[in-house]
Interface confidence: medium
């Protein structure tokens, strides 16, 4: 993994890279390799494509071995028929201010998300759309079904968050978490990403996890029963250890994978969960990475191009677990 060893290249001749993929010198200055693309795993030896403005994002300092190729400028977003650059903010309507971040859009409300509790002077608070106003406003209904609308009242405002207590209420934050994107690889280890603002200051952040839809070496078509065209979730005979750039998972996992079809359909994860997996590297270092585990798969005709992470952001979404935040309290 590191550059301390002597240069040893896999082949004498330079590799042949797919169209659009740069041939670059590895990070150790040893061998010419095909540059890793957006969303792919990268190491010191396997650099990201510099001609596309990609860099290897190692995340926390504990994971300095393996990173994910991330766009410096970020992937653009398509939203409401318009294209927005990563980092660009726009108003999707009078109610929402949105930001594009690495191909995903997150929005925060411009209208107050406050709560009004019943009180003696306003026993029946109700939000109504007033003519000429974008945001709904609080009004006080009279009891006994009388619908005379009083003046709009100032509403109870959630307290702002100023410190590390994760249980503090957040002011004016519509918590949004996108579904996990489809795995960047149709077989073998890939990356799945999502964007969330479920954090202390309602800021958009990108999260990533490892994923494996199916092993590349498995010949799954053999297992399709006669008269059937698909095998949705093939049985895995024995527990497996995951490999990640020369590092191996500490535990074995009886993981579910998605099958294949012979009629042009593709099978992709439908319900997933995210669990931490520890990998042990040859030098003894232990890395912890979040990884997708498949609960159910679905077979469908909505099949984007293989390993196209951009398309996967737009077409195939996974229904999975929401973010789990652990805190020291």
């Amino acid at each position: 993994q590191d550059c301390s060893a002597q240069c040893q290249c896999a082949a004498e001749a330079a590799p042949h890279c797919p169209a659009g993929v740069s041939l670059v010198l590895d990070g150790c200055g040893c061998c010419r390799v095909c540059a890793k693309q957006l969303g792919e795993l990268c190491t010191e030896r396997d650099p990201c494509d510099p001609h596309k403005g990609l860099f290897c994002d190692f995340g926390s300092p504990a994971n300095r071995k393996i990173g994910v190729c991330t766009a410096k400028d970020g992937a653009p977003c398509v939203f409401g028929g318009s294209v927005y650059r990563s980092g660009e903010s726009f108003q999707s309507s009078c109610k929402y201010q949105c930001t594009c971040l690495d191909g995903a859009v997150g929005c925060v409300p411009l209208c107050s998300m406050d709560v009004r509790l019943p009180s003696p002077d306003c026993p029946f608070p109700r939000r109504v759309k007033l003519p000429g106003k974008c945001c709904e406003e609080w009004v006080c209904d009279e009891p006994k079904d009388r619908t005379a609308v009083g003046p709009a009242l100032a509403a109870y405002r959630l307290e702002d968050t100023f410190g590390p207590d994760p249980t503090m209420m957040r002011a004016n934050c519509l918590v949004q978490t996108t579904e996990w994107s489809a795995c960047s690889k149709t077989c073998g280890m890939g990356i799945s990403t999502r964007v969330t603002n479920d954090n202390t200051f309602c800021r958009l952040e990108k999260q990533s996890r490892l994923c494996m839809v199916r092993p590349c070496e498995a010949d799954l078509e053999e297992n399709i029963k006669k008269g059937k065209k698909c095998i949705r979730t093939p049985k895995i005979a024995k527990p497996v250890k995951f490999e990640l750039s020369g590092c191996t998972s500490v535990k074995t996992y009886r993981a579910k994978f998605c099958g294949v079809c012979t009629d042009g359909r593709c099978c992709t994860p439908h319900r997933t969960t995210t669990l931490p997996v520890e990998f042990k590297c040859p030098d003894g270092e232990i890395m912890k990475k979040n990884m997708m585990f498949i609960k159910t798969c679905a077979c469908h005709y909505n099949c984007p191009g293989d390993n196209d992470i951009f398309e996967s952001l737009y077409y195939r979404k996974m229904y999975g677990d929401m973010a789990h935040h652990h805190h020291h309290h």
């Epitope: 307290e159 702002d160 968050t161 100023f162 410190g163 590390p164 207590d165 249980t167 503090m168 209420m169 202390t200 200051f201 020291h328 309290h329």
Partner: antibody
Framework: EVTLKESGPVLVKPTETLTLTCTVS????????VHWIRQPPGKGLEWLGV???????DYNAAFMSRLTISKDTSKSQVVFTMTNMDPVDTATYYC????????WGQGTTVTVSS | ETVVTQEPSFSVSPGGTVTLTCRSS?????????ANWVQQTPGQAFRGLIG???NRAPGVPDRFSGSILGNKAALTITGAQADDESDYYC?????????FGGGTKLTVLG
């Protein structure tokens, strides 16, 4: 109006236990945490600990073995207990609301002397 | 032991701008340190000005702003007034505890 008020003994003997109460109004202890901070005479501030709105606590490691913070939400009171008091613990003790330490009590001066 | 360092004293002319800083001994200050700024007036009363790096506490005028400048937390006071003459303390959060800086005594000249 948000207010916090510390109460407790003014004089404590060495090795004794100090118990201070912070009574709050204008907000609920289920909505905000409360910090305890002290200021020795002529010196700066020292953070002692916090009880969060959900009841969890964090303490300054230097005082961990001597310090307990608890609360009675229904009474709007936070109780601060420090054991084995020493003359170096002489200071003005404050409670402050979590959320940027935005509101503070007026402080209570505690002298540790025999 | 983590030490949080502030300028011991600072002076500013009325109407001027001053930036007080807060340095951590164990590396750059980030938003995860939730930098807080507290004012202690000559009458010994305390009030919070800024929490969570840049969020003003209720009732604090917008002359006060918080940010991260380089590797330090910063409190900027624009249009300084005579009653801004006070001691200013920063507090940084380190995963399980806060640490206060030694404080800066701000003098408004004139």
């Amino acid at each position: 109006e948000v207010t916090l008020k510390e109460s407790g003994p003014v004089l404590v003997k060495p090795t004794e236990t100090l118990t201070l109460t912070c009574t709050v109004s204008g907000f609920s202890l289920s909505t905000f945490g409360v910090h305890w901070i002290r200021q020795p005479p002529g010196k700066g501030l020292e953070w002692l600990g916090v009880i969060w709105r959900r009841g969890g606590t964090d303490y300054n490691a230097a005082f961990m073995s001597r310090l307990t913070i608890s609360k009675d939400t229904s009474k709007s009171q936070v109780v601060f207990t420090m054991t084995n008091m020493d003359p170096v613990d002489t200071a003005t003790y404050y409670c402050a609301r979590d959320g940027g330490f935005d509101y503070w009590g007026q402080g209570t001066t505690v002298t540790v002397s025999s | 032991e983590t030490v949080v360092t502030q300028e011991p004293s600072f002076s500013v002319s009325p109407g001027g701008t001053v930036t007080l800083t807060c340095r951590s001994s164990i590396g750059a200050v980030t938003t995860s340190n939730y930098a807080n700024w507290v004012q202690q007036t000559p009458g010994q009363a305390f009030r919070g000005l800024i929490g969570g790096t840049s969020n003003r506490a209720p009732g604090v005028p917008d002359r006060f702003s918080g940010s991260i400048l380089g590797n330090k937390a910063a409190l900027t006071i624009t249009g300084a007034q005579a009653d801004d003459e006070s001691d200013y303390y920063c507090a940084l959060w380190y995963s399980t505890h806060y640490v206060f800086g030694g404080g800066t005594k701000l003098t408004v000249l004139g």
